[in-house]
């Protein structure tokens, strides 16, 4: 089984644009990294800008769910 742990200090630059880095701990596979992106960014390393229209749609859905 695999689980997520926060990246070590020296691994944090895996993500750009202020994305939060996580490491997928998996005994059977090499370490993988994932990014939790800041609002306005997406992609494997948070490199992609989310168009404003999409951002507003996400906020609306979030409010509706609350």
């Amino acid at each position: 089984t695999s689980h997520l742990v926060k990246c070590a200090e020296k691994e944090k630059t895996f993500c750009v644009n202020g994305g939060e880095c996580f490491m997928v701990k998996d005994l059977s596979n090499p370490s993988r990294y994932l990014c939790k992106c800041q609002p306005g960014f997406t992609g494997a390393r948070c490199t992609e800008n989310v168009p404003m229209k999409v951002q507003n749609q996400e906020k609306a859905e979030e409010l509706y769910q609350k």
Partner: antibody, heavy 116, light 107 residues
Framework: EVQLVESGGGLVQPGGSLRLSCAAS????????IHWVRQAPGKGLEWVAA????????NYADSVKGRFTISADTSKNTAYLQMNSLRAEDTAVYYC?????????WGQGTLVTVSS | DIQMTQSPSSLSASVGDRVTITCRAS??????LAWYQQKPGKAPKLLIY???NLESGVPSRFSGSGSGTDFTLTISSLQPEDFATYYC?????????FGQGTKVEIK
């Protein structure tokens, strides 16, 4: 051992095209981030473009946007830089580099000269 | 785009000297700052990333510090093989941007 080998450089006339290749070995190509960086003769380093082979996302410097296209073929472990509408100011050594937490491995570079 | 400014642009030093190069970003880049060494006719080589993390295989005489907008590369005791040009690079956001370089020459 990680290795990056660039090829495809040469002399081209203004307005012409070239395709650079970056052949990679010694690491999981699909799991990395590939960048192209250039260096004009006697000048500093300039970031050009990047691709994440895993999801195909691409990014470009404003100076090359609309003229250059970065791509990757994961079956060949090779990244490409298609350069169109070349200008004299594109003359440089072009390096490809892998990025894990920074640009950790670099190729030897290939020289592109744009001149009539 | 984030502008990176290095100082000095060149310096002369002797073997054994302590050398300090500074790099300033035009806006906050947190700790996302890398340093590269380049020798004539060769590709750049990564020395430091994340402001202070020493790349594997790089001698411990190299060290980096700083966060936010102000960063420093220090060579504690300059060796003959350290005469080269050094570049800083912010890797906080795209486009990735480099400083103009600092050439370390023999006095």
């Amino acid at each position: 051992e990680v290795q990056l080998v660039e090829s495809g450089g040469g002399l081209v006339q203004p307005g012409g095209s070239l395709r650079l290749s970056c052949a990679a070995s010694g690491f999981t190509f699909s799991g990395t981030w590939i960048h192209w960086v250039r260096q004009a003769p006697g000048k500093g380093l300039e970031w050009v473009a990047a691709i994440t082979p895993a999801d195909g996302s691409t990014n470009y410097a404003d100076s090359v946007k609309g003229r250059f296209t970065i791509s990757a073929d994961t079956s060949k472990n090779t990244a490409y830089l298609q350069m169109n509408s070349l200008r004299a100011e594109d003359t440089a050594v072009y390096y490809c580099a892998t990025y894990m937490f920074a640009m950790d491995y670099w190729g030897q570079g290939t020289l592109v000269t744009v001149s009539s | 785009d984030i502008q990176m400014t290095q100082s000095p642009s060149s310096l002369s030093a002797s073997v054994g000297d302590r050398v300090t190069i500074t790099c300033r970003a035009s806006q906050d880049v947190k700790k996302s700052l890398a340093w590269y060494q380049q020798k004539p006719g060769k590709a750049p080589k990564l020395l430091i990333y994340g402001a202070s993390n020493l790349e594997s295989g790089v001698p411990s005489r190299f060290s980096g510090s700083g966060s936010g907008t102000d960063f420093t590369l220090t060579i504690s005791s300059l060796q003959p093989e350290d005469f080269a040009t050094y570049y800083c690079q912010q890797h906080y956001t795209l486009p990735l941007t480099f400083g103009q370089g600092t050439k370390v020459e023999i006095k």
